[in-house]
Amino acid sequence: AVNGTSQFTCFYNSRANISCVWSQDGALQDTSCQVHAWPDRRRWNQTCELLPVSQASWACNLILGAPDSQKLTTVDIVTLRVLCREGVRWRVMAIQDFKPFENLRLMAPISLQVVHVETHRCNISWEISQASHYFERHLEFEARTLSPGHTWEEAPLLTLKQKQEWICLETLTPDTQYEFQVRVKPLQGEFTTWSPWSQPLAFRTKPAALGKDT
């Protein structure tokens, strides 16, 4: 099992959560493993139990405090360890000195709502969740709209290169059902990645007025 390819990846949500995934080919599903976090300049340590998410990967969330509390800063280094039980003792399987603000992945945007809808356009707004005040306005967004007969993968990406928590979708078809998703990414961090996509927001454009050209 030890010789199988293994990987340990963690991201900080910028507030009070470090989410980790541990994968190892050939490891037994019922292996008991945990992630241990040891910050270099904090008095707390934190542990979470890795739970299986697929045949060869496990995940857990290190909850560092209240969801909106700022538990780490740009100068913190957190030593992370994967520990797996082997008989009566714990064995270290992976180690990393983790710089939280170099490894960011924010929570998905929330509270998506239709502000105004017409026949050909729709104005949508959203909010960011549990994002650090350190970012100020240094965030970007990607959005996509699901049209009838298409898949999310086929939807063109709309890029918002600033902290803009709304969008006006145009050139839509009247009386048509659409879905909309958005995701967010801080500009900071060498290994920072996009948040998960938000929950889809379903909306329908207004029908064209009778007797008028569309």
């Epitope: 040891w38 270099d40 280094i77 992976a94 000195d97």
Partner: nanobody
Framework: QVQLVESGGGLVQAGGSLRLSCAAS????????MGWFRQAPGKEREFVAA????????MYAESVEGRFTISRENAKNMVYLQMNSLKPEDTAIYYC??????????????????WGQGTQVTVSS
């Protein structure tokens, strides 16, 4: 790019000690997790020890725990493996490895991007 050059290998009697050194060149060394692996004749390359870039985290193969110590000196771009109470079964070529940039040190070879050429350690009984 990280270039790695090992030194310090040699012939030693069982129960003796050796200190292996790994000299690294490359700007990212000071924020890269490092490891040592070894390959005995006719066997697969196996994990020996690893260390995080600050030196706060270490891990060892069960077979060397308590006998070997991994350390590093970032100011000199060096990683060391102090090997005490050597046994004939420690005979192997020892390789220094640099983990993938920004990634954890793991026990599998696939987690490492850069490798040295190796240094021979022979333990006679």
């Amino acid at each position: 790019q990280v270039q790695l050059v090992e030194s310090g290998g040699g012939l030693v009697q069982a129960g003796g000690s050796l200190r292996l050194s790994c000299a690294a060149s490359g700007r990212t060394f000071s924020t890269t997790e490092m490891g040592w692996f070894r390959q005995a004749p006719g066997k697969e390359r196996e994990f020996v020890a690893a260390i995080t870039w600050t030196g706060r985290g270490t891990m060892y193969a069960e077979s060397v725990e308590g006998r070997f110590t991994i350390s590093r000196e970032n100011a000199k771009n060096m990683v060391y493996l102090q090997m005490n109470s050597l046994k004939p079964e420690d005979t192997a070529i020892y390789y220094c490895a640099a983990a993938r940039r920004g990634r954890a040190a793991v026990r599998s070879e696939g987690g490492y991007d850069f490798w040295g050429q190796g240094t021979q350690v022979t333990v006679s009984s």
